[in-house]
């Protein structure tokens, strides 16, 4: 393969130094080998993004409006499979527990804070507000276009996109995936949602010039605002209960 790049993750460094001269790609910031035939985990992508910010690389600087969760960007700890570790800490020894999408689900504490497990986010609600159009999109056409997008671009199994709701100009995409439902090769809804979020913001993680091209019966879908809500298999443990928006 003369073109040794990672089509699914531009935040990688690739070479042909592996066995048999096979192209291998490692995530920036962690040096973890990634599978370029599928999506890279959100944890490794966040880590790469933070390392790129530190090194001053301009192509991955987040936009001023980038809100991943209520605490903003952080440099996460990932396990050997690229998943978020249950406990995350910053440089000042402030720690907190996160869910499987890396969003804080407890109050912040010190290094004595215990996080027994990574609580799975089994329901992601993506809320989009589209730019005004001459007339509302046909709900059925919009539904099939978004299902096609998640299946083709993010390789998310159709059963994990449970519903598309539409009340002009608000679109809601519901992703649901229990731990028991996720097969070995299945894309995680957390990763699909993150890739979609970056695509919507014009910060695609895919290689090449081909960006997001969402259109409903020839009418382009332009998104003005995105909100992402994460619902976990266990309720969050804040002293004041709240829903986590991203």
């Amino acid at each position: 393969q003369s073109n040794c790049t990672c089509p699914t993750n531009k935040m990688t460094v690739c070479d042909t130094n592996g066995p048999g001269g096979v192209c291998q790609c490692r995530a920036m910031g962690s040096q973890v080998l990634v599978d370029c035939s599928t999506l890279t985990s959100k944890c490794l992508l966040l880590k790469a993004r933070m390392s790129a910010r530190k090194s001053g690389r301009s192509l991955v600087m987040p936009s001023e409006h980038a809100i991943l969760d209520n605490d903003g960007l952080y440099d996460p700890e990932c396990d050997d499979k690229g998943r978020f570790k249950a406990r995350q800490c910053n440089q000042t020894s402030v720690c907190w527990c996160v869910n499987s999408v890396g969003v804080r689900r407890t109050d912040k504490g010190d290094q004595s804070l215990r996080c027994d497990e990574v609580v799975r986010t089994h329901h992601i609600l993506i809320e989009l507000r589209h730019r005004p159009t001459d007339r509302a999109f046909n709900h059925s056409d919009l539904d099939s276009e978004l299902r096609r997008l998640f299946q083709e671009r993010y390789k998310l199994h159709p059963s994990f996109l449970s519903a598309v709701h539409y009340e002009e100009p608000t679109i809601q995409i519901e992703l649901r995936q229990n731990a028991s439902q996720k097969g070995l090769r299945d894309v995680d809804i957390a990763d699909a949602a993150y890739y979609f979020e970056r695509d919507i913001k014009g910060e695609s993680l895919f290689m090449g010039r081909r960006g997001l091209d969402v259109q409903v019966r020839g009418e382009p879908l332009h998104v003005e605002r995105t909100l992402i809500y994460y619902l976990d298999e266990k309720p969050p443990q804040f002293s004041m209960k709240r829903l986590t928006a991203g």
Partner: antibody, heavy 126, light 103 residues
Framework: AVTLDESGGGLQTPGGALSLVCKAS????????MFWVRQAPGKGLEWVGV????????NYAPAVKGRATISRDNGQSTMRLQLNNLRAEDTGTYYC???????????????????WGHGTEVIVSS | ALALTQPSSVSANPGETVKITCSGS???YGWFQQKSPGSAPVTVI????KRPSDIPSRFSGSTSGSTGTLTITGVQADDEAVYFC????????FGAGTTLTVL
């Protein structure tokens, strides 16, 4: 049935320009990426270029880059290939083809072609 | 552009199983049958393993790593043709073609 009909081929002079048209029927043209593929006499298939559903994105093979323009008219279900500064090596049969995966990250890949036209022959000679 | 490698020729007796491989890209593979030079190609497999509705079920496709495989189970005389693979991550590429001879 999916039908793709190419037209516009024939004898062309070196340095000139050609315009090929692909007329599609039997499917919702607006929902598919479209390709041009050519085959020189006695040779293999050569990917020429691709255009996405809306026409906002095109990609071309190095051999035609800077000389080729692919456009489409979704209302008429047609795609066009304009090729300028013709050379002898542009001789061959030009096929219009349909891409099955418009959102895939590697959607420019010939691996997604699921239907072909019958082809139109182009001869570049003085 | 990526170079796709496939064997120049394979042969088989009627009823046998034939496998044609194509390597060189991690993208999605397609397989195209051309029965005579200048005749239009026919897609027998696209998107790694999808088969158009008018293609017999004896044609199947699979991928492993950067290699795609076209399998014809119970090859018939009518399957004699040149088979091209197609792929590439960022722009289209075709293999040079494999001539299938049915003995």
């Amino acid at each position: 049935a999916v039908t793709l009909d190419e037209s516009g081929g024939g004898l062309q002079t070196p340095g000139g320009a050609l315009s090929l048209v692909c007329k599609a029927s039997g499917f919702d043209f607006i929902d598919y990426d479209m390709f041009w593929v050519r085959q020189a006499p006695g040779k293999g298939l050569e990917w020429v270029g691709v255009i996405n559903r809306s026409g906002s994105y095109t990609n071309y093979a190095p051999a035609v880059k800077g000389r080729a323009t692919i456009s489409r008219d979704n209302g008429q279900s047609t795609m066009r290939l304009q090729l300028n500064n013709l050379r002898a090596e542009d001789t061959g049969t030009y096929y219009c083809a349909r891409g099955a995966c418009t959102h895939c990250w590697d959607a420019d890949s010939a691996g997604y072609i699921d239907a072909w036209g019958h082809g139109t022959e182009v001869i570049v000679s003085s | 552009a990526l170079a796709l490698t496939q064997p120049s020729s394979v042969s088989a007796n009627p009823g046998e199983t034939v496998k044609i491989t194509c390597s060189g890209s991690s993208g999605s593979y397609g397989w195209f049958q051309q029965k005579s030079p200048g005749s239009a190609p026919v897609t027998v497999i696209y998107w790694n393993d999808k088969r158009p509705s008018d293609i017999p079920s004896r044609f199947s496709g699979s991928t492993s790593g950067s290699t795609g495989t076209l399998t014809i189970t119970g090859v018939q005389a009518d399957d004699e043709a040149v088979y091209f693979c197609g792929n590439a991550d960022s722009s289209g590429t075709f293999g040079a073609g494999t001539t299938l001879t049915v003995l």
